[in-house]
C-alpha cells in the first residue's frame, strides 16, 4: 500500500471517484479528474491501496493553455466490465508529481444484489424408488442466503436445523418430477433452473436360463419397480462370446453390434431361436416404461447345448483286398454342432442282419473277412456322433474289389488290435 501519499491541500485532484453498488455482471465506470501544471502524469488506479496492474482505464489530456507547459486537465476512467466479488473495495487514483505522490479521495465499489447461484440442480434419470441427491448453492452479498427447495413447484418443508440445505437428499420417486431451488436474501429471491428428474424402471434382476437346446435358449427375468409407469417392453441383447469377451464385459457396450430382441411384457420370458449349437453367448436385459429404459443387467454367460452333426461323413469307400476290407471316410463338411466324439460304422449283406460298430475318432478301419462263402451285396455306412447323438448316416457303399494302384491300407491301421479289426465269423 502507498503510505507516503497526500490528499490534503495542494492535491491536483478536482474530481474523485464515486461509489458503485450493484449486482454481479454490472458494467461500471469510476472517474477522477485532475489539473496539473506542465506535462500531464500517468494516472494509476489503486484498489484497497494496491496498484491495479491490468486496469482497464482510459486517460484524456486536454490543454487548458497554449503551451504544453501551461495547465492541463487530465481525466482517467476505470472500467469494471463485469462486477464480481473480487472487484469490491476502495478505489483511488494516484499520480506522481515533482517527486511527490498524490492520491484522490476514495470511491467504493460494492457487490450487492439478488443471490447468485454457484450450483444449480441438474437433470437426472433415476431408477424408481431409488435415493438420489440434488445440489444447489447460492451466495450474496448481501448474506445470509437461505435456500428453499421446490418439488413440482410446491415448497418442501426444510429439514429441521437445515434452513440452507445445499444438498437435497430424496428417498426416491415413483413419478417423474421437477425440482428447483429458491435463494433468498435481503435484496429478494432468485430461482434456479428447473431440473427434471425422470423416473426410469429399476434394473431387472434374476436373469436366468429356463431351458437349453442346441439352437434355442429360453430365458426369464424378474422386472424391477417402475413407479406409476407400467413397463411397455423389454429389450434383450445377445452377443457371441469370444476370446476377448473379458475385455469388454466390464464396459457398457460390446465390441460389435449385438442381436437385440424386443419383447412385450408380461410374461417376463423369451425364447431365443436360431442360435448356434454348442456356442457360448452373453445376454443382458433392459426393460422400458413410457419414461425410458432401465439400466441393463450385467452380462450373463449362457451356452446352447450340443447338437448332432448336420451331415454324414464324406467320401466313404470300402475296398476288398483278399480277406481284408479297408473302409475309409472323411469328416463331415457340414457343422458338427458340438464336439466330435467318434464315428459308428454299419454293414449288412443281402441276407444278413445289420451290424453296428463304434470306431472312435479314426477315419479308416480294416475289417478281416473270414469264412469260405462270400456274402452277396455287402454295403457299408458311416455316421459321425457328438454327445447329442448320431448325425445322418452316409448312403450305403457297396464293397469294391481291390485294384492295383489304389494304394495300400495303412499298415498301422491294418495291424491294429480289436476293436479296430473285426471278424465276420459267418463268412
Amino acid at each position: 500500500a502507498h503510505k507516503d501519499t497526500q490528499t490534503e491541500a495542494g492535491s491536483p485532484f478536482v474530481g474523485n471517484p464515486g461509489n458503485i453498488t450493484g449486482a454481479r455482471g454490472l458494467t461500471g465506470t469510476l472517474r477522477c479528474e485532475l489539473q496539473v501544471q506542465g506535462e500531464p502524469p500517468e494516472v494509476v488506479w489503486l484498489r484497497d491501496g494496491q496498484i491495479l496492474e491490468l486496469a482497464d482505464n482510459t486517460q484524456t489530456q486536454v490543454p487548458l493553455g497554449e503551451d504544453w507547459q501551461d495547465e492541463w486537465k487530465v481525466v482517467s476512467q476505470l472500467r469494471i466490465s463485469a462486477l464480481q466479488l473480487s472487484d469490491a473495495g476502495e478505489y483511488q487514483c494516484m499520480v506522481h508529481l515533482e517527486g511527490r505522490t498524490f492520491v484522490s479521495q476514495p470511491g467504493f465499489v460494492g457487490l450487492e444484489g439478488l443471490p447468485y447461484f454457484l450450483e444449480e440442480p441438474e437433470d437426472k434419470a433415476v431408477p424408481a424408488n431409488t435415493p438420489f441427491n440434488l445440489s444447489c448453492q447460492a451466495q450474496g452479498p448481501p448474506e445470509p442466503v437461505t435456500l428453499l427447495w421446490l418439488q413440482d413447484a410446491v415448497p418442501l418443508a426444510p429439514v429441521t436445523g437445515h434452513s440452507s440445505q445445499h444438498s437435497l437428499q430424496t428417498p426416491g420417486l415413483n413419478k417423474t418430477s421437477s425440482f428447483s431451488c429458491e435463494a433468498h436474501n435481503a435484496k429478494g429471491v432468485t430461482t434456479s433452473r428447473t431440473a427434471t428428474i425422470t423416473v426410469l424402471p429399476q434394473r431387472p434382476h434374476h436373469l436366468h436360463v429356463v431351458s437349453r437346446q442346441p439352437t434355442e435358449l429360453e430365458v426369464a427375468w424378474t422386472p424391477g419397480l417402475s413407479g406409476i409407469y407400467p413397463l411397455t417392453h423389454c429389450n434383450l441383447q445377445a452377443v457371441l462370446s469370444d476370446d476377448g469377451v473379458g475385455i469388454w464385459l466390464g464396459k457398457s457396450d460390446p465390441p460389435e453390434d449385438p442381436l437385440t430382441l424386443q419383447v412385450s411384457v408380461p410374461p417376463h420370458q423369451l425364447r431365443l431361436e436360431k442360435l448356434l449349437p454348442h456356442t457360448p453367448y452373453h445376454i443382458r436385459i433392459s426393460c422400458s416404461s413410457s419414461q425410458g429404459p432401465s439400466p441393463w443387467t450385467h452380462w450373463l454367460p449362457v451356452e446352447t447345448t450340443e447338437g448332432v452333426p448336420l451331415g454324414p461323413p464324406e467320401n466313404v469307400s470300402a475296398m476288398r483286398n483278399g480277406s481284408q476290407v479297408l473302409v475309409r471316410w472323411q469328416e463331415p463338411r457340414v457343422p458338427l454342432q458340438g464336439t466330435l466324439l467318434g464315428y459308428r460304422l454299419a454293414y449288412r449283406g443281402q441276407d444278413t442282419p445289420e451290424v453296428l460298430m463304434d470306431i472312435g475318432l479314426t477315419r479308416e478301419v480294416t475289417l478281416e473277412l473270414r469264412g469260405d462263402r462270400p456274402v452277396a451285396n455287402l454295403t457299408v455306412s458311416v455316421t459321425a456322433y457328438t454327445s447329442a447323438g448320431d448325425g445322418p448316416w452316409s448312403l450305403p457303399v457297396p464293397l469294391e474289389p481291390w485294384r492295383p494302384g489304389q494304394g495300400q491300407p495303412l499298415h498301422h491301421l491294418v495291424s491294429e488290435p480289436p476293436p479296430r479289426a473285426f471278424s465276420w465269423p459267418w463268412w
Partner: antibody, heavy 121, light 107 residues
Framework: EVQLVESGGGLVQPGGSLRLSCAAS????????IHWVRQAPGKGLEWVGW????????YYADSVKGRFTISADTSKNTAYLQMNSLRAEDTAVYYC??????????????????WGQGTLV | DIQMTQSPSSLSASVGDRVTITCRAS??????VAWYQQKPGKAPKLLIY???FLYSGVPSRFSGSGSGTDFTLTISSLQPEDFATYYC?????????FGQGTKVEIK
C-alpha cells in the same frame, strides 16, 4: 468537432476477410472506449465489440469471437475491425461509436454519443 | 444475455401528439439504459443516457424514465423531424443489447 469516419467496407466472399477503419478527429481515442455496432439490412442494432485504445484491451460479442479482432493505433487516432472467416450473416452496415459514460465520479453503464456514418459489408 | 423488449414495434401518430415507447429488460439493469433515434440511411443518435438524462443538444420534448426492468421514452409533442425508429439499449452487463426498435410513422 468530434467526428468518426469508417472506411474499408465492400463485397467479400464467404470465408473471406476485410479490415474496417474508424478514423477519429476532434478527440483523443485514448480517453474513451470505442465500440463497433452493426445493423443487418432492415434489422436492428447488434453490438460487435469494444476496445480501450489506451490499453489495447478488447471485448467481443459471442457471435464474432475468434473471427473478428478490434485494435487501435493511438498515434493515428484510428480504430480497426479485422474480420476473418466472414459468413453471409455478417452482412451489415458497420458503425464505430464513441462511448459516453456521463460525468461525475462514477456511473453504471454507458451510452454511445458519436457514431460514424457506417460502412456496408 | 439480457433481452430488451420494445413496444410497440411501430406506431402512427400526428404532429403534436404525445408519444410513449416502452422497453422492458429481462432482468434488473438499474438505470443503465440509453435511447437512440435513427433515420433511414443514417447512424443512430443518442437522446437519453442513464435512463433519464437528456444528452446535450437534444430537444427537451424528449424525456426518459424508469429503473430496474421497465423504461419509457416520451416525446411530449411530436414534431415532423421526430418520425424515425427509436432503440433502447442496456449497458448494465456485457454484452450491451438493443431493443428491436419502434418505428414512429406519420398518421
Amino acid at each position: 468537432e468530434v467526428q468518426l469516419v469508417e472506411s474499408g467496407g465492400g463485397l467479400v466472399q464467404p470465408g473471406g476477410s476485410l479490415r474496417l477503419s474508424c478514423a477519429a478527429s476532434g478527440f483523443s481515442l485514448s480517453g474513451s472506449w470505442i465500440h463497433w455496432v452493426r445493423q443487418a439490412p432492415g434489422k436492428g442494432l447488434e453490438w460487435v465489440g469494444w476496445i480501450n485504445p489506451y490499453r489495447g484491451y478488447a471485448y467481443y460479442a459471442d457471435s464474432v469471437k475468434g473471427r473478428f479482432t478490434i485494435s487501435a493505433d493511438t498515434s493515428k487516432n484510428t480504430a480497426y475491425l479485422q474480420m476473418n472467416s466472414l459468413r453471409a450473416e455478417d452482412t451489415a452496415v458497420y458503425y464505430c461509436a464513441r462511448e459516453y459514460s456521463g460525468w461525475g465520479g462514477s456511473s453504471v453503464g454507458y451510452a454511445m454519443d458519436y457514431w460514424g456514418q457506417g460502412t456496408l459489408v | 444475455d439480457i433481452q430488451m423488449t420494445q413496444s410497440p414495434s411501430s406506431l402512427s401518430a400526428s404532429v403534436g401528439d404525445r408519444v410513449t415507447i416502452t422497453c422492458r429488460a429481462s432482468q434488473d439493469v438499474s438505470t443503465a439504459v440509453a435511447w437512440y433515434q435513427q433515420k433511414p440511411g443514417k447512424a443512430p443518435k443518442l437522446l437519453i443516457y442513464s435512463a433519464s438524462f437528456l444528452y446535450s443538444g437534444v430537444p427537451s420534448r424528449f424525456s426518459g424514465s424508469g429503473s430496474g426492468t421497465d423504461f419509457t421514452l416520451t416525446i411530449s409533442s411530436l414534431q415532423p423531424e421526430d418520425f424515425a425508429t427509436y432503440y433502447c439499449q442496456q449497458s448494465y452487463t456485457t454484452p450491451p443489447t438493443f431493443g428491436q426498435g419502434t418505428k414512429v410513422e406519420i398518421k
